[in-house]
């Protein structure tokens, strides 16, 4: 499956929207930094099959969608930007779903990519627990926003690599 150029553009648009979503001066949030343990190895195209990487992207976008769909998230961010962000994520989910089913049979996907999907879920679990522990403070959301931007940037670079390999 050749990940469409539109998917990469969608990822970039999502990153731009995330960048625009900041509400407070992030300089006051240094001490709230946290090691979420981004599962970089899951997205390493050299170690894992393309189908695994794609399903990991899919899970990451799905979890991002879930994270930013909560009522706590709605209270933290600008509604208009959030709606635009949802649309980009939804479009990316559609692109990736088509890609995953093309790469591997639907029945095989769940089993084959279980470990990488689990790693992504645990990563988002750590993010959720961090937000809860920080009582969804503005700084906690800033740190999470920065983290999601970094993980999105990483996966965007990898998608470019996957397209080049084809």
């Amino acid at each position: 499956c050749d990940l469409p150029q539109t998917h990469s553009l969608g990822n970039r648009r999502a990153l731009i929207l995330l960048a625009q979503m900041g509400r407070i001066s992030h300089f006051s949030c240094l001490k709230d930094r946290y090691d979420f343990g981004f599962p970089q190895e899951v997205f390493d195209g050299n170690q894992f099959q393309k189908a695994q990487a794609i399903s990991a992207f899919h899970e990451m976008i799905q979890q991002t969608f879930n994270l930013f769909s909560t009522k706590d998230s709605s209270a933290a961010w600008d509604e208009t930007l959030l709606d635009k962000f949802y649309i980009e994520l939804f479009q990316q989910l559609n692109d990736l779903e088509a890609c995953v089913t093309q790469e591997v049979g639907v029945e095989e996907i769940a089993l084959m990519n279980e470990d990488s999907i689990l790693a992504v879920r645990k990563y988002f679990q750590r993010i959720t627990l961090y937000l809860m522990g920080k009582k969804y403070s503005p700084c906690a959301w800033e740190v999470v926003r920065a983290e999601i931007m970094r993980s999105f940037s990483f996966s965007t670079n990898l998608q470019k690599g996957l397209r080049r390999k084809d």
Epitope: A19, G22, S25, H26, F27, S28, C29, L30, K31, D32, R33, Y34, D35, F36, E142, V143, A146, E147, M149, R150, S153
Partner: antibody, heavy 121, light 107 residues
Framework: EVQLVQSGAEVKKPGESLKISCKGS????????IGWVRQMPGKGLEWMGI????????AYSPSFQGQVTISADKSISTAYLQWSSLKASDTAMYYC??????????????WGQGTLVTVSS | DIQMTQSPSSLSASVGDRVTITCRAS??????LNWYQQKPGKAPKLLIY???SLQSGVPSRFSGSGSGTDFTLTISSLQPEDFATYYC?????????FGQGTKVEIK
């Protein structure tokens, strides 16, 4: 390869203005903050301030607030440090360094080579 | 502002010696502490970040420890290229602040 390349040495007179630069390459310039550090001759390191090139938000050390201005042009991946009226006491080596912002990653992992500013009448 | 105090301000040691430099913060900074090495005429180089994480490419003879207010940089076996000035820096909150430096000289 990540690089921060600073502009060359400057010799100025007291009262003159100056703008020095720091150009980033080999990484996403807007994904990292750029900090500025002063080192006066024979002295230690002093943090001056920082900028987030993605939105040009800045933070200054109280010691340097109002004395210098930090800016950035993300279209050319360059950060700046400027003075409107130099003093002899501004004579120092000035370094830029990149900072990961709110991400859990090494602070000031890459530094520019430094710009020597000499202010003398 | 958070004050950072390094000790000693200078020390003399021989190649092969174990060297310890301490850094104390005026208030708790958790593990938001970095260590840098600077040689004359050169830019500082990051050695340790988040108190104990070794920066990529830095020899394993360098190690960092501590949390809260008291931190230590240890060089397990001093090498000729290690003679330099070492700075600690807190990255807990703005303004970021450096220690005054510790100069490691040849005995």
């Amino acid at each position: 390869e990540v690089q921060l390349v600073q502009s060359g040495a400057e010799v100025k007179k007291p009262g003159e203005s100056l703008k020095i630069s720091c150009k980033g390459s080999g990484y996403s310039f807007t994904s990292y903050w750029i900090g500025w550090v002063r080192q006066m001759p024979g002295k230690g390191l002093e943090w001056m301030g920082i900028i987030d090139p993605s939105d040009s938000d800045t933070a200054y050390s109280p010691s340097f607030q109002g004395q210098v201005t930090i800016s950035a042009d993300k279209s050319i991946s360059t950060a700046y440090l400027q003075w409107s009226s130099l003093k002899a006491s501004d004579t120092a080596m000035y370094y830029c360094a990149r900072h990961p912002g709110l991400n859990w990653a090494p602070d000031f992992d890459y530094w520019g080579q430094g710009t020597l500013v000499t202010v003398s009448s | 502002d958070i004050q950072m105090t390094q000790s000693p301000s200078s020390l003399s040691a021989s190649v092969g010696d174990r060297v310890t430099i301490t850094c104390r913060a005026s208030q708790s900074i958790a593990d938001f502490l970095n260590w840098y090495q600077q040689k004359p005429g050169k830019a500082p180089k990051l050695l340790i970040y988040f108190a104990s994480s070794l920066q990529s490419g830095v020899p394993s003879r360098f190690s960092g420890s501590g949390s809260g207010t008291d931190f230590t940089l240890t060089i397990s076996s001093l090498q000729p290229e290690d003679f330099a000035t070492y700075y600690c820096q807190q990255s807990h909150s703005f303004p970021l602040t450096f220690g005054q430096g510790t100069k490691v000289e040849i005995k």
